[in-house]
């Protein structure tokens, strides 16, 4: 008894605020941000819920766990059957994917009045009779049955809920069981799919509340999307279906990708892996451009399907050949521009002095923002610079072969410590804006993982091209392949490095001086960090604006509730 | 307010049926559940069944399977048949409502007498 | 079934005074919500029965407070202090906790 209809025999006020607190909650069910997990699968999902005699202060909490679960699951193309069984079995609500009329059904459901046996086989043959029924009118659309008892089976009505519940399964059913307070686990693993089909519920029924998320992730098989989901005409694709509990299947040997092609001809393709959130699956050839494939998996072999919004659609491709010829000139033009660039360097080789950096280094930036170029540095306290005794430490800057012709010829005392610097360019920290917050990073691109190997290539790129800009001629420069030539300035060096104060007289205009370094640009942040995870995708039925409501507007007085 | 009405005394002869009635009115009818309850001299208080007006469906005390038969009808009336009846089905039968607090409302009673 | 045993079958009691009830069921009453589900009814004499105590120790309504329940899991005792003549009639104790329902056998309350 305990229904909303006598109601009576079930839970009294301390209810009252329960059950309220339970429908706001219930309410936000199928919004994923906040209302916790939902499942968004198209499949037909039968509740067989025991009604009998030993549930009879129990009624409440059988109503509310199926409340919540049943507005977790809000594909529109879920469709829904409430069946009670005691004495006998009813449908209480046939299979519907109407919100309203499962409204209806939860409505009705909170009336029911327990009592009778536990003829839990005669749930089972109503929800085998619809399962047959729509499989004739030529739906085959996969059922999951969740089934609910609280005691011991005796023998007899053992056997006939486990001959009962093959038959479902011959049906092409995924059968779970949710056993409450004196069940045996061992009946329910065999009437369910397997051990791991049941969901033990030894704290009693009001620890029903406790399950609805493990039921949820396992009963749940949802296709979320399919990359890619635009093919070429004429091509041969794999296709990565992506979604949830793909690994439910009592064998996943008999999952299939099915693709249903403008609504009439359907193709069933071998996925050529499982994984509980992703199958990889050949896509069919599909000829012409325009046509749509909506996008199926079965679980058991093609006996039936579990349906989804998701489409796939073929455009026109341009011919590979056109693309393969494009790219072959194009290399062929880099290879050219490359010999050009190099050709000189095997021929003249000009060895000059690198004119001497300034006296004093100093780390800040240059005017463009960037950091200057780093040499390595000697510690030079060993030999005697920078005050008495060569206490102090003195850095002395390192050209590549020595700033003059003495210091090429300078060999490093013994204890001399070099530091060479981590990379040749250092690029300035990203800012940070106040309260320590990076700049928000943009939104991520299709081209993101291309443009950063791109980027990365380039800076190696730049990274050659200065330092082989330094050693290479000028117009005005001369030599033969192989015949080299020293140039030498009239300017003595002094040594250490402060030719750039020496003002007696102006050097000579070097032969060459090298250009200066062409400005570095740090390489453009990655176009986003690892993306947030995205929401469902836009082929997917957006979830209900409103959830359904979970009860008929409120009597004029409050509805009595049923006796604890 | 709240009220059960039984119809009349019944005066039968052995192995025939009754057929006895409930009408409930001030509230709503389909919202509660039905109980039907013996009270004869040698065995006190006993309880029969419980019927669902909402849904049809009824719970029978073992000992009153085929012997009592619990309906509805759309005028907001329960109904018990007693078949078959002997001079032990002699008694009082009364309709109780269920509720949040069941059995708060009674019906007066139908006497059933079985007499050749 | 669960089997509902009530004493004393009659008391007689002088109009003020105060009087207990008894009954035991076979099987605890308490259930696992934490509710015990026993109740108590009055039968005057011609009338049908009326509610006094629902859940072991809730006071039905229009019920007055003279009456009380109390008890544990097997054992149940309903006490009327300062008994009216109206009081009198025949008291029924009832296990609600599951089917079928059973009733005690009935305690008769007489005003000396």
């Known amino acids: 008894m305990a229904t909303a209809e006598r109601r009576a025999l079930g839970i009294g006020f301390q209810w009252l605020s329960l059950a309220t607190l339970v429908l706001i909650c219930a309410g936000q069910g199928g919004r994923r941000e906040d209302g916790g997990p939902a499942c968004y699968g198209g499949f037909d999902l039968y509740f067989i819920l025991d009604k009998s005699g030993s549930v009879l202060h129990h009624w409440n909490e059988i109503y509310y766990f199926v409340e919540q679960l049943a507005h977790k699951f809000i594909s529109p193309q879920l469709r829904m059957s409430f069946i009670v069984f005691s004495t006998r079995g009813t449908t209480l609500m046939k299979l519907t994917e109407d919100r309203e009329q499962i409204r209806q059904g939860l409505e009705e459901l909170q009336k029911v009045l327990p009592g009778g046996d536990t003829y839990m086989h005669e749930g089972f043959e109503r929800a085998s009779e619809q399962i047959y029924y729509e499989n004739r009118q030529g739906y085959r659309t996969a059922s999951v049955i969740i089934a609910l008892t609280d005691g011991e089976l005796h023998e007899d009505l053992f056997f006939y809920s486990e001959r009962e519940a093959n038959r479902s399964r011959d049906l092409g059913a995924i059968v779970y069981c949710v056993g409450v307070k004196d069940f045996n686990e061992t009946q329910l693993a065999r009437i369910a799919d397997s051990k791991d089909h049941v969901f033990p519920v030894n704290d009693g029924f009001q620890a029903l509340q406790g399950i609805i998320h493990s039921i949820l992730k396992k009963s749940c098989i949802e296709i979320l999307a399919a990359e890619p989901s635009t093919i070429c005409a004429g091509e041969s694709f794999q296709v990565v279906v992506r979604g949830n509990g793909f690994r439910h299947a009592r064998n996943v040997d008999r999952v299939l990708c099915s693709f249903k092609i403008n609504d009439s001809v359907t193709l069933n393709e071998k996925p050529f892996s499982v994984e509980d959130t992703y199958l990889l699956c050949p896509a069919p050839i599909l000829k012409e451009v325009g046509m749509k494939a909506a996008l199926q998996v079965s679980m058991n072999d093609g006996l039936s399907f579990i349906s989804s919004s998701v489409i796939i659609t073929t455009t026109h491709c341009s011919d590979g050949s056109i693309l393969a010829i494009a790219l072959l000139i194009l290399f062929l033009l880099l290879a050219l521009a490359l010999l050009w660039w190099f050709w000189p360097l095997c021929c003249t080789v000009i060895i000059k002095e690198v004119p001497p950096p300034p006296a004093e280094e100093s780390e800040e930036e240059d005017d463009d923002g960037l950091p200057k170029k780093k040499w390595p540095t000697v510690d030079a306290s060993y030999y005697g610079g920078r005050g008495v005794g060569g206490i102090k430490r003195m850095e002395v800057r390192w050209g590549e072969k020595g700033s003059t012709e003495e210091g090429a010829k300078l060999e490093k005392a013994k204890n001399a410590r070099v530091k060479m610097p981590e990379q040749e360019y250092e690029f300035p920290e990203p800012r940070n804006l106040n309260n320590n917050m990076r700049r928000p990073s943009s939104p991520r691109k299709w081209y993101s993982p291309i443009k950063g190997k791109l980027d990365a290539l380039w800076v190696l790129l730049r990274k050659g091209y200065d330092r082989v800009s330094v050693m290479r001629p000028q117009p005005g420069d001369t030599g033969r392949c192989i015949n080299f030539t020293r140039v030498k300035n009239n300017q003595p060096a002094k040594y250490p490095l402060n030719n750039a104060y020496h003002t007696s007289s102006p050097p000579p205009a070097p032969i060459y001086t090298p250009p200066p370094p062409a400005p570095h640009c740090p390489p453009p942040p990655p176009s986003a960090p690892t993306p947030p995870i995205p929401s469902p995708p836009s082929t997917l039925p957006p979830p209900p604006q409103a959830p359904p409501p979970n009860r008929a507007p409120p009597p004029s007085r409050p509805p009595p509730r049923p006796s604890v | 307010q709240v009220k059960l009405e039984e119809s009349g005394a019944e005066l039968v002869r052995p192995g025939v049926s009754v057929k006895i009635s409930c009408k409930g009115s001030g509230y709503t009818f389909t919202d509660y559940a039905m109980h039907w309850v013996k009270q004869s001299h040698a065995k006190s208080l006993e309880w029969i069944g419980v019927i669902s007006t909402y849904f049809g469906d009824a719970t029978y005390n073992q000992k009153f399977k085929g012997k009592a038969t619990m309906t509805v009808d759309s005028s907001s009336t329960a109904y018990m048949e007693l078949a078959r009846l002997t001079s032990e089905d002699s008694a009082i039968y009364y309709c109780a409502r269920e509720d949040y607090v069941p059995f708060a409302y009674w019906g007066q009673g139908t006497l059933v007498t079985v007499s050749a | 079934d669960i089997v509902m045993t009530q004493t004393p079958p009659s008391v007689p009691v002088t109009p003020g005074e105060s009087v207990s009830i008894s009954c035991r069921s076979s099987k605890s009453l308490l259930h696992s919500n934490g509710n015990t589900y026993l109740y108590w009814f009055l039968q005057r004499p011609g009338q049908s029965p009326q509610l006094l105590i629902y859940r072991m120790s809730n006071l039905a309504s229009g019920v007055p407070d003279r009456f009380s329940g109390s008890g544990s899991g097997t054992a149940f005792t309903l006490r009327i202090s300062r008994v009216e003549a109206e009081d009198v009639g025949v008291y029924y104790c009832?296990?609600?906790?599951?089917?079928?329902?059973?009733f005690g056998s009935g305690t008769k309350l007489e005003i000396k």
């Open positions: 009832m296990q609600h906790l599951e089917y079928p329902f059973t």
